[in-house]
Structure formats: C-alpha cells, structure tokens
Interface confidence: medium
C-alpha cells in the first residue's frame, strides 16, 4: 500500500469520524435540551436515571469521544489515539452483540420486568408529578392508553389517554411495533455493526501503515 493509499485511508477515516462527531454533537445537544425542558419525567422509579434526556446525553457523548479519537488519530497519524479508537469500538461492538443476545434470550423475562415496572409507575401516577409527566407524554405521543389498555387505570383513564373508542395499550403497541419492524431493526443493527467493523479495520490498517511508513522513512 503506497503513500496515496495511506492518504486516502487517512482522509476517509477522518471524514467519516468528523461526520459521526457532528451527529454525536447533535444527539448530545438534543439530550441536554431534553434535560433542561424535562417534560418526559421518570417512568421507572427503580431506574431513576433512565430518562430520555440521559440516554441521549450518554449515547451522544460516547459517539463524540469515539469519533474524536478517530478524527485526531487519523489526521495526526497518532498510533496511540488510533489504538484507543480501535479498542473503544471493539468494546462497543462486543457490548452491542452481548446486549442483542441477552435481549433475544431473555425477551420474556424482560417483558415481565418492564410490565411490572410500568404497573408500579401507573400506581404512582396521581402521587408523583414526574411519573404523571412521563405517562402523559407517552400516551399523547404514541396515541395509546395504559400498559395494555384503558383497564390499567383503576380510577379511570387520565385526560392524556386518547378518546379513541378502541384505544390500544402503550406497551402492547410498542411491543407490536418492534415485532412488526424486527427485520428493519435487525438490518439497521447489522449496518451499525458493519460500520464499526469497518472503522476498526481502517484504524488497524492505518496503524500498520504508519509503522511501515515510519520504517521506510527511517524513523
């Protein structure tokens, strides 16, 4: 692989990481916006940090850090930064694969756990403003009512439930959406993994090339 190939590799890695860094910035920015204008509240009280704002902030920050390492490592041809980029991507990839396997294996258990958490939060609707805000946002946005339907609201459905004569439950609706779009979700996940593997390959190749180029120049 010649100098021109190295340059191409270097700039491809830089350009794509710059793109991801900008995306990370946007996600982080949106997350901060959600945290400031917190209309969503807390749905699971046993996981108080699991809010939409926090999720966006964490995901955005991870993307920014990884992309920053990729950008700087490639443009400066810094082996240390490139290896950090490679290792971080590898950890993320392994975490994603592990999570996907766990979700697949323990889907039923997860369903029960989520349903229990949602039932607990419904009981807190009238006593906790944060829970009320979370349910009101979800029901208005998804046009659904309760977990499995209006029956979940023992004292009658709240005003945020749509007045649809045959309204569906939020969890039931979300679960159905995931099952219906399983193929597309799978394709997107595979694409993300492929991008990560490509990023790792490019980083490793560039790393090796830096070694070879250094030897050729006589450094």
């Amino acid at each position: 692989m010649g100098m021109s190939s190295l340059k191409l590799l270097k700039y491809v890695l830089f350009f794509f990481n710059l793109l991801f860094w900008i995306c990370g910035c946007c996600i982080l920015g949106f997350g901060i916006y959600l945290l400031i204008h917190n209309n969503f509240g807390v749905l699971f009280h046993n996981l108080p940090s699991l809010t939409l704002g926090n999720v966006f902030v964490i995901v955005g920050s991870i993307i920014m850090v990884v992309a920053f390492l990729g950008c700087m490592g490639s443009i400066k041809e810094n082996k240390c930064l490139l290896m950090s980029f490679f290792i971080l991507l590898l950890i993320i990839l392994l975490a994603e694969v592990t999570l996907a396997i766990l979700l697949f294996v323990y889907e039923q258990k997860l369903n029960e756990y989520v349903a229990k958490g949602l039932t607990d939060s419904i009981h807190r609707y009238h006593s906790d403003n944060s829970t009320k805000a979370a349910w009101d946002s979800i029901q208005s946005f998804l046009q659904c009512c309760g977990i499995n339907g209006t029956s979940d609201w023992t004292s009658g459905p709240p005003a945020s439930c749509p007045s649809d004569r045959k309204v569906e439950g939020c969890y039931a609706k979300a679960r159905l959406w995931f099952h219906s779009n399983f193929l597309y979700i799978g394709i997107i996940t595979i694409c993300v993994c492929v991008i990560e593997v490509l990023g790792m390959s490019f980083a490793l190749t560039l790393n090796c090339q830096i070694d070879k180029t250094s030897q050729t120049i006589g450094l």
């Epitope: 499995n148 007045s163 439950g169 609706k173």
Partner: antibody, heavy 118, light 112 residues
Framework: QVQLQQPGAELVKPGASVKLSCKAS????????MHWVKQRPGQGLEWIGM????????NHNGKFRGKATLTVDKSSSTAYIQLSSLTSEDSAVYYC???????????WGQGTSVTVSS | DVVMTQTPLSLSITIGQPASISCKSS???????????LNWFQQRPGQSPKRLMY???KLDPGIPDRFSGSGSETDFTLKISRVEAEDLGVYYC?????????FGGGTKLEIK
Amino acid sequence: QVQLQQPGAELVKPGASVKLSCKASGYTFTSYWMHWVKQRPGQGLEWIGMIHPNSGSSNHNGKFRGKATLTVDKSSSTAYIQLSSLTSEDSAVYYCARDDYAETMDYWGQGTSVTVSS
Amino acid sequence: DVVMTQTPLSLSITIGQPASISCKSSQSLLYSDGKTYLNWFQQRPGQSPKRLMYQVSKLDPGIPDRFSGSGSETDFTLKISRVEAEDLGVYYCLQGTYYPWTFGGGTKLEIK
C-alpha cells in the same frame, strides 16, 4: 364465512376459576377486536370487555376488573376469558363477539353457559 | 358509566302492525369523529344476539328493510313497520361511544 365456536357448558365449583374459549374462523383473527358479553339467566346483556388479538391490548368494564382476564392465542385463532373466584353471581351465558372495527359486534358465538354450583 | 334506558319493557303486537322501541342515553352519544355509535340487537329465544342496526340507522346486511332506526345524541328509536312472527324476541340497544360500553335493559317483543 365468519364463525365463532364456543363450548356449550361448564360446571364449576364456587371459589374456583374457569377459562372459556372462543375459536374464530373465516376471517383474519388478528385484524379484529374480540368482545366478551355476559348474560345472566332471564336478564339483559352486560359488556365485559374487548381484546385486540394482534397487540394484546384490552379494555375492560371496571365492574369486571379482577374477575375477568382476556387473552388470545394467535396461533390457534382463539380468544379466552378467565373468570376467577367464582360465585353464584357468575352463573351466566358468556358470549364472544367479533368487532368489525368500524362498528361493534357483528358476529356472535353461540355462548358458553357457566353454572357455579357445589 | 353511560346509562341506557329502554322503553317499554315489553310489547305485545299483532302481526302486520307497527312497533316502536325507545332508547335514551344519560349523555350524548355523538363521538368526536362525528359518528353516533348506537346499535340495535335482536335476541330470539334460545339464540345469540344478532346485530340489526349500527350507527343509529345503518341496516346490517340481510336484515329486512321493515326495520329502521332513528334519533340523535340521547334519544333513539327502533321501528318495525310491519311486525312478523319471526320478529319475536328481546331487543337491546348498545352504546359504543364511551367506556364501558353499555346495553339497554332490553324490550321483549311478543306476538298477539
């Protein structure tokens, strides 16, 4: 043509539970809500609730909360109603009825007669 | 819950004569989509209920046109222009606008 098949009768002891079935055929089971209606001997009709077979969403009459549980088995196109802690008040005919989405209960099953007796 | 009040409780009609059943709801059944979800059902002795009419006045397929429905908001009427022997049974109105859906108490139609 649309058919809803229900077993004829069930005899159960007080305090026990019973699960009634309603097997649907002649249409796409997952596309229509399914209702359950109660009729005590010599009395009127009472709406228990309805379930959407595709999502499992259900809407109940508050009066039957804790008494009736609606479920479905998509693979066999069957809707179920489980009645718990049975008393003589639960002795009745239980009908399942398909909802035509634009409206209500266009096709009815023959009904299952539940007798609660020791 | 929306209360559906049917009158009369029973009705004895000679074959060929008209019959009228009233159904009043405790609140307007006009839904936000502009439709009124009021249905009429017929239950012959020993049989399952059968839908006759939906959205106040729309006749179900296969139902003779001697049956007609009218009314709006809280007052509804089922009319049979000429009663026939096969019309005997109990007639119920049902509202499907609000949860829980509620039936009227029923009107027993007997043939004189």
